[in-house]
């Protein structure tokens, strides 16, 4: 049967027939920065070009893994996972390998930097199609390595990296912590985070998604027809590099932001058992397992959004946390969250010509997170409308008054240390959906956007009795752009988007006062773009044979037992 | 040993061509910072990536590297430029004593300096 990992990333509609794309990724070049590789292995022969780049430190032990097979083990396996004939994800992708890791699997930040520079220079000398760079390595947090990754990403290169195998916050490692890089954690056949003893996959807000990374069968450097299972976040990253190659081959014009949004969108949602992660990391860690899209056309019409968490603000009274979107994403809403519930809300503000989401800690608070909702909205013109705290007891309100602008998100920020829970909850007047309403002592910020064909609606779910979590989801075809709570009282810990669901968290019910004080409403703003839908339909009408679905349906490949190929 | 002698000759030449002192002192108020790996066993002291400000040209990177070598030589330290970066980040990779960090941070165009560290297969 098909190996579990390839089955897992295959869209459900193809699983029964075991379709495998015959030449997916053929327009894409994947650079691999790793150990040396056995390029004559039959899985990757003719698919991997070994560059003359080598920058590795001396082995610490004079004979450690000096036998070629062990020196080549890691890189050969990963090359096979990306593009191997039998066990590869993107069987059509061509690869180039750079040696930055020695026989012990050890390299340096400087060697990796020089390798990335080599790729950039190669790209300038001989521009090719889309480039994917796979970095199946990790070191401690490095400002310079992250900066180099950022520059390369801004030059149009897609970088995919391993989250790390330290059972730790991926933000403490590089290049995993670089925002521009697609950072991949590892899951097993049961969709559980990969564990090994006290270690295992990294997690946290710096991880973009997870992918198969345990007992992955692939090319073994022991012989040219050998296969072996390996485990680690490198294997997971190799799957995503392969998926990215497939997507880029089908749609070569995809930007990094578009690719990342699609990877997130087509992932399996909420299948990972979050109990494995430390409690404080669960909310920050994406519950996503990578998968190939069922097809690429039909995706274009969708309004894609993702949730970006900031770093923790720290506990000082005036501490703030900032969440940012990628350069070609729009910040459509901003929310905040604090485990202690002591926060002073959030606001959208301009920074360097771009909107950012800033959350404010409160006195006695343990710190806050800012949560940005980052979306792909071509030709968007967004602005923030602010209303200062109201004098009247009815509360503060602000709406989108410009013609053609729609409300995509609401934020509220207050200077007082505690809004208190004794004031009656504020209810939105009926028939005025295009406005944000909040506590009278808070300033309210409305995100108002104009984009071709953009339409939005407000969806609320109120619970009269105290409850630790209130959720409201957008319907099929609509995308969650905004998530906030009504009222913004002190027992509300905050609000955040998980996929297409708005989650409002409140303090433990046992610490909440009476039921009227415990009333919480989750407010979701759901949007869609008629313009994108139209454009996609036109594209589908004029294009044929270039989508992933066409590649999938082009050929059915049987999975052979490996030993059939040895003679 | 031959390598080092060659390097030292180069330094002497650099000494003659460089003006003494900091002709292009860093702009007032902008202090370059030093970074190193938080995980001690992964640190590689003695090798440093000197990152220059964004718009620094290759010629300026090379000049800054030579200046560091000249000023280090004046203090009796041997340094070795291992690589000059351009294309992604402006800067250079240098093998030198940690004693020279303070000096290096004061060089013109320097944005920050990072001590080299290990990365590992995952």
């Amino acid at each position: 049967s098909i190996p579990w990992n390839l089955e897992r990333i295959t869209p459900p509609r193809y699983r029964a027939d075991e379709y495998q794309p015959p030449d997916g990724g053929s327009l894409v070049e994947v650079y691999l920065l790793d150990t040396s590789i056995q390029s004559d292995h039959r899985e990757i022969e003719g698919r991997v070009m070994v560059t003359d780049f080598e920058n590795v430190p001396e082995e610490d032990g004079t004979r450690f893994h000096r036998q070629a097979s062990k020196c080549d083990s890691h890189g050969t396996h990963l090359a096979g996972v990306v593009s191997g004939r039998d066990a590869g994800v993107a069987k059509g992708a061509s690869m180039r390998s750079l040696r930055v890791l020695n026989c012990q699997g050890k390299g340096t930040v400087s060697g990796t930097l020089i390798g990335l520079e080599f790729i950039r220079k190669s790209q300038l000398v001989q521009p090719v199609g889309p480039l994917v760079v796979l970095l199946p390595l990790a070191g401690g947090y490095s400002r310079v390595l992250n900066a180099a990754c950022q520059r390369l990403a801004r030059a149009g290169v897609v970088l995919v990296t391993a989250a790390g195998n330290f059972r730790d916050d991926a933000c403490l490692y590089s290049p995993a912590s670089a925002p521009e890089v697609i950072t991949v954690g590892a899951t097993n056949a049961q969709d559980q985070p990969v564990t090994l003893g006290t270690l295992g996959t990294n997690f946290g807000r710096c991880v973009d998604l997870f992918a198969p990374g345990e007992d992955i069968i692939g090319a073994s450097s022991d012989c040219s027809t050998c296969f072996v299972s390996q485990s680690g976040t490198s294997q997971a990253a190799a799957h995503v590099a392969g998926i990215a190659a497939m997507m880029l081959s089908a749609e070569p014009e995809l930007t990094l932001a578009e690719l990342r949004q699609r990877l997130i969108h087509f992932s399996a949602k909420d299948v990972i058992n979050e109990a494995w992660f430390p409690e404080d990391q669960r909310v920050l860690t994406p519950n996503l397992v990578a998968a190939l899209p069922p097809s690429t056309h039909g995706a274009g019409w969708q309004l894609f959004c993702r949730t970006v968490w900031s770093a923790h603000s720290g506990p000082t009274r005036m501490a703030t946390a900032v969440a940012r979107c990628a350069p070609d994403e729009e910040l459509l809403s901003c929310s905040s969250f604090s485990r202690s519930g002591k926060r002073r809300g959030e606001r959208m503000e301009a920074q360097g010509g771009k909107l950012v989401c800033r959350a404010h800690n409160a006195f006695g608070g343990e710190g806050v997170y800012a949560i940005a909702r980052c979306c792909l909205l071509p030709q968007a013109n967004c602005s923030v409308h602010t209303a200062p705290p109201a004098e009247a007891s009815m509360g503060t309100r602000v709406h989108c008054h410009q013609q053609g602008h729609v409300l995509t998100g609401c934020s509220s920020h207050w200077e007082v240390e505690d809004l208190g829970t004794h004031k009656p909850p504020v209810l939105r007047p009926r028939g005025q959906p295009n406005q944000c309403v909040g506590h009278r002592e808070a300033s309210i910020h409305a995100s108002c956007c104009h984009a071709p064909g953009l339409e939005c609606k407000v969806k609320e779910h109120g619970i009269p009795a105290p409850q630790e979590q209130v959720t409201v989801a957008c319907e099929e075809g609509w995308t969650l752009t905004g998530c906030s709570a009504l009222p913004g009282t002190s027992h509300v810990l905050g609000a955040y988007a998980v996929d297409n669901t708005c989650v409002v968290r409140s303090r433990d019910v046992s610490t909440t006062g009476s039921t009227s004080e415990g009333a919480v409403t989750a407010v979701a703003i759901c949007c869609r773009s008629r313009h994108l839908a139209q454009a996609s339909q036109e594209l589908q009408g004029s294009t044929s044979g270039s989508g992933l679905n066409d590649i999938f349906e082009a050929q059915k490949i049987e999975w052979h037992e490996h030993h059939h190929h040895h003679h | 040993q031959e390598d080092e002698d060659g390097d030292y000759e180069e330094l002497v030449l650099a000494l003659r061509s460089e003006e003494d002192g900091l002709a292009e002192a860093p702009e007032h108020g902008t202090t370059a910072t030093f970074h190193r790996c938080a995980k001690d066993p992964w640190r590689l002291p003695g090798t440093y990536v000197v990152v220059l400000k964004e718009e620094t040209h290759l010629s300026q990177s090379e000049r800054t590297a030579r200046r560091l070598q000249a000023q280090a030589a004046r203090r009796g330290y041997l340094t070795k430029i291992l690589h000059v970066f351009h294309g992604l980040l402006p800067g250079f990779l240098v093998k030198m004593s940690g004693d020279l960090l303070e000096l290096a941070l004061k060089l013109p165009h320097v944005d920050y300096i990072e001590e080299d560290s290990s990365v590992f297969a995952q």
């Epitope: 190996p3 082995e59 610490d60 032990g61 004079t62 004979r63 450690f64 893994h65 000096r66 036998q67 062990k70 083990s73 890691h74 396996h77 012990q104 699997g105 195998n165 090994l196 007992d215 069968i217 073994s220 022991d222 012989c223 027809t225 050998c226 296969f227 072996v228 299972s229 390996q230 485990s231 680690g232 490198s234 037992e561 490996h562 030993h563 040895h566 | 590992f120 297969a121 995952q122």
Partner: antibody, heavy 121, light 107 residues
Framework: QVQLVQSGAEVKKPGASVKVSCKAS????????IHWVRQAPGQGLEWMGE????????KFNQKFKDRVTMTRDTSISTAYMELSRLRSDDTAVYYC??????????????WGQGTTVTVSS | DIVMTQSPSSLSASVGDRVTITCKAS??????VAWYQQKPGKSPKLLIY???NRYTGVPSRFSGSGSGTDFTLTISSLQPEDFATYFC?????????FGGGTKVEIK
């Protein structure tokens, strides 16, 4: 669960051969190298060699190179170790072990229960 | 071949004692060392891989350290079930070799 089950005890005469089997279950047999390790009575462990079941790839300790043969039958997920020209000092418990690769680490995570081979005239 | 010299070959200790076993490699093996526990009539069981990483399900009282040529296995507080023989193994280069073993007995 993942396990390796070995064949039963054997008594052999000097000069004869013995073939020990190791049946794998609970995982993809072709994905993991099988190593053979022996332990003479009251002694330490001695590595004999390895086979990668996805192929016929083998690697041996030079000490046994001329006398040992390692094979596998993927249809029944079983690895075999045959030792020929037996001598009395080959009397030992023979273990098979699965080698796992995680990140850039190698280790034996699962062992068979052992097969006692007695060589006596 | 790389020789792994383990010491002591046997030791007597009481429940609750801190026990340290050392292993010396004849040449640098970086951190390519594993430690196994073996009870009479049973097969070895993996405790530590890559010199210092505790394997799944192994109690936290077991720890490993070292790199290069000198390695240590420490049992912080000996429990009744820990009385067994312990082996180190290098997988730095072929042939893989084991230490002679350390038998931990009840005092």
């Amino acid at each position: 669960q993942v396990q390796l089950v070995q064949s039963g005890a054997e008594v052999k005469k000097p000069g004869a051969s013995v073939k020990v089997s190791c049946k794998a279950s609970g995982y993809t047999f072709t994905g993991y190298t099988i190593h053979w390790v022996r332990q003479a009575p009251g002694q330490g462990l001695e590595w004999m060699g390895e086979i990668l079941p996805s192929s016929t790839y083998t690697k041996f300790n030079q000490k046994f190179k001329d006398r040992v043969t390692m094979t596998r039958d993927t249809s029944i997920s079983t690895a075999y170790m045959e030792l020929s020209r037996l001598r009395s000092d080959d009397t030992a418990v023979y273990y098979c072990a699965r080698e796992r690769i995680y990140s850039n680490y190698w280790f034996f995570d699962v062992w068979g229960q052992g097969t006692t081979v007695t060589v006596s005239s | 071949d790389i020789v792994m010299t383990q010491s002591p070959s046997s030791l007597s200790a009481s429940v609750g004692d801190r026990v340290t076993i050392t292993c010396k490699a004849s040449q640098n093996v970086y951190t390519a060392v594993a430690w196994y526990q073996q009870k009479p009539g049973k097969s070895p069981k993996l405790l530590i891989y890559s010199a210092s990483n505790r394997y799944t399900g192994v109690p936290s009282r077991f720890s490993g350290s070292g790199s290069g040529t000198d390695f240590t296995l420490t049992i912080s507080s000996l429990q009744p079930e820990d009385f067994a023989t312990y082996f180190c193994q290098q997988y730095s280069s072929y042939p893989y070799t084991f230490g002679g073993g350390t038998k931990v007995e009840i005092k």
